[in-house]
Amino acid sequence: KGMHAAQPAVVLASSRGVASFVCEYGSSGNAAEVRVTMLRQAGSQMTEVCAATYTVEDELAFLDDSTCTGTSSGNKVNLTIQGLRAMGTGLYICKVELMYPPPYYVGMGNGTQIYVIDPEPCPDSD
């Protein structure tokens, strides 16, 4: 079943290569288990950046080696991507799946264009 997901159109990464945005989805109703996936679209190719499943009892938990962190509150997920470089500029799509109990719902945002500007190297000081 379809579900709406919303995310900001544009986000500028910090000089440290960190970008954060909120992914909000249509009310989870009685969903007890929610899976959030961050996808990066480059041209016609879509790659998974990171994913996490959380339950209404637990906080959002990405794998320890993930480039993402996040917190959840109701039907909002605050996602943070770290370690971004200029080549990481692109469209980042939030996908939300209401996994359990049935029925299954899936929603995809329109994507957030994340702009990453690599910091200029510091000039040598005399």
Partner: antibody, heavy 116, light 112 residues
């Protein structure tokens, strides 16, 4: 504190009807599915079905389709079980239970006795 | 429907001894998302059931580490490493993977 308080149990004649209540408190009622579980005297637990408290959509186990109806009053945070055309074999303790990915919270149970 | 079969029907264990209860499902209870919603509950006379284990092997908060769950697919086990007097009651497995969700028939644990 999260609580599920049940009421409405009674002695009913065969063919009669009864409505059981389960009042929830201590959490947002519409965030969790609510279930009914039956336990006949000296027997095991039997899952009757559940109702989505957000959409109001019920799901019934086959044995409970027809004579049993789940309903809600979200303004009162209350779940109901309407039972019609009651038979002696419906004599049991009826539990309500809140489900997420498990049942951490149960009502205390309420007893229906069907006898002439 | 998924039939959940528990064995034994009853067991009598001395305090401090281990106990094991088996639960077998008539078909795989792996849900479409890859999770297995298999739980264990303990019911004492005149009381509501209490959650012990969820998703096969996760202990619910406050449950002593004497209790452990294991298994996959269709075969599941609840183990109590050292039985205590407070563990007496009827243990039920439950599957929440395939509607209609179903309970096992129960296993009565008595203390010698």
């Amino acid at each position: 504190e999260i609580q599920l308080v049940q009421s409405g149990g009674d002695l009913v004649k065969p063919g009669g009807s009864l409505r059981l209540s389960c009042k929830a408190s201590g959490y947002t009622f519409t965030n969790y599915g609510m279930n009914w579980v039956r336990q006949a005297p000296g027997k095991g637990l039997q899952w009757m079905g559940w109702i989505n408290t957000y959409t109001g959509e019920p799901t019934y186990a086959d044995d409970f389709k027809g004579r049993f109806t789940f309903s809600l009053d979200n303004a009162k945070n209350t779940l109901y079980l309407q039972m019609n055309s009651l038979r002696a074999e419906d004599t049991a303790v009826y539990f309500c239970a809140r489900r997420s990915i498990y049942y951490p919270y149960w009502g205390q149970g309420t007893t229906l006795t069907v006898s002439s | 429907d998924v039939l959940m079969t528990q064995t034994p029907l009853s067991l009598s264990v001395s305090p401090g001894e281990p106990a094991s209860i088996s639960c077998r499902s008539s078909q795989s209870i792996v849900y479409s998302n890859g999770n297995t919603y298999l739980e264990w509950y303990l019911q004492k006379p005149g009381q509501s059931p209490k959650l012990l284990i969820y998703k096969v092997s996760n202990r619910f908060s406050g449950v002593p580490d004497r209790f452990s769950g294991s298994g996959s697919g269709t075969d599941f086990t609840l183990r109590i490493s050292r039985v205590e007097a407070d563990d007496a009651g009827v243990y039920y497995c439950f599957q929440g993977s395939h509607v209609p969700w179903t309970f096992g028939g129960g296993t009565k644990l008595e203390l010698k």
